[in-house]
């Protein structure tokens, strides 16, 4: 397939929640009027789906109601959030566009973004 | 064994409707990307249309756009082309045919396996 | 969209000789094609994808060659089992995916 560059962040730190956010730009060759956006994660030489989106230009993305993902888009950037993240999340997040409509179809995938998750320190027991 | 079995070919007049079915054996078909590939007789090969591995997804052929439509189910491992508004140009064997999909590159776009076609004929 | 012309439409050749048909495509496709062979009265069967990497169980006296708008597929010594019209197909810009016109090989 036709090939597009997709640029993301090398590395993003999750908040104290265990929400990261990044953002991810393609640079769409043609007037795409349907894309399609995944968050794939890689451990281990496995990769798997986290998420998935698509949307028509100017509008809003959607995520499945029991994803874990929200985003926005904004011309060819997409701001993506992950939420949820725990420390064993931890690993490469890989940003991956598809312009489904016009054809030609057209795939990028970007390098990844490392997602640090810490975990947060349970609060002390008080004595009051 | 791995295998598409393709049917619902027949005789229809110009103008009606008919459904194929191509079944699917052997793999896990809700991992490959599905397309259909006519043969009018005596002629060459004409890519007709593609769905995603999980249907996501369709594209056509312009000599075929708005009266095809092509549909999986994949609890029952089976592709479908509903063809409507069918003319004597459509007549061919009809070929499912199946295409590799890799999460990180997409649809490889060539066919690593084919049924043996199902024949169909529009004709008054 | 592109074109795929296929030369010769058919060649006849004797067992042992060796087989050139060419592909060219109307725009550079990299080495996005696939080679099928389709003998009489059967399906289709993948031999190359790539423009030359030789699909599993194809027999090493088949090959493929060529990038950009140029190909070739090369039967080193003719079988009468390479009896077949063969296809080129071009999916480096899909949809739409687009078939030569195919060449029949017989044996003399």
């Known amino acids: 397939c036709k090939a597009m560059h997709v640029a993301q962040p090398a590395v993003v730190l999750a908040s104290s929640r265990g929400i990261a956010s990044f953002v991810c730009e393609y640079a769409s060759p043609g007037k795409a009027t349907e894309v399609r956006v995944t968050v794939l994660r890689q451990a281990d030489s496995q990769v798997t789906e986290v998420c998935a989106a698509t949307y028509m230009m100017g509008n809003e993305l959607t995520f499945l109601d029991d994803s874990i993902c929200t985003g926005t888009s904004s011309g060819n950037q997409v701001n993506l959030t992950i939420q949820g993240l725990r420390a064993m999340d931890t690993g490469l997040y890989i940003c991956k566009v598809e312009l489904m409509y016009p054809p030609p179809y057209y795939l990028g995938i970007g390098n990844g973004t490392q997602i640090y998750v810490i975990d947060p320190e349970p609060c002390p027991d008080s004595d009051f | 064994q791995v295998q598409l079995v393709e049917s619902g070919g027949g005789v229809v007049q110009p103008g009606r409707s008919l459904r194929l079915s191509c079944a699917a054996s052997?793999?896990?078909?809700?991992?490959?990307?599905m397309h259909w590939v006519r043969q009018a007789p005596g002629k060459g090969l004409e890519w007709v249309a593609v769905?995603?591995?999980?249907?996501?997804?369709?594209y056509y052929a312009d000599s075929v756009r708005g009266r095809f439509t092509i549909s999986r189910d994949n609890s029952k491992n089976t592709l479908y082309l509903q063809m409507n508004s069918l003319r004597a140009e459509d007549t061919a064997v009809y070929y499912c045919?199946?295409?590799?999909?890799?999460?990180?590159?997409?649809?490889?776009?060539?066919?690593?396996?084919w049924g043996r076609g199902t024949l169909v004929t529009v004709s008054s | 969209d592109i074109q795929m012309t296929q030369s010769p439409s058919s060649l006849s050749a004797s067992v042992g000789d060796r087989v050139t048909i060419t592909c060219r495509a109307s725009?550079?496709?990299?080495?996005?094609l696939a080679w099928y062979q389709q003998k009489p009265g059967k399906v289709p069967k993948l031999l190359i994808y790539?423009?030359?990497t030789l699909q599993s169980g194809v027999p090493s006296r088949f090959s493929g060659s060529g990038s950009g708008t140029d190909f070739t597929l090369t039967i080193s010594s003719l079988q009468p089992e390479d009896v077949a019209t063969y296809y080129c197909?071009?999916?480096?810009?899909?949809?739409?995916?687009?078939f030569g016109g195919g060449t029949k090989v017989e044996i003399k």
């Open positions: 045919a199946r295409d590799r999909y890799d999460i990180l590159t997409g649809p490889y776009w060539y066919f690593d396996l």
């Open positions: 052997g793999f896990t078909f809700s991992s490959y990307g």
């Open positions: 769905i995603w591995y999980d249907g996501s997804n369709k």
């Open positions: 725009q550079g496709i990299s080495n996005y």
């Open positions: 790539a423009a030359s």
């Open positions: 197909q071009k999916y480096n810009s899909a949809p739409p995916l687009t």
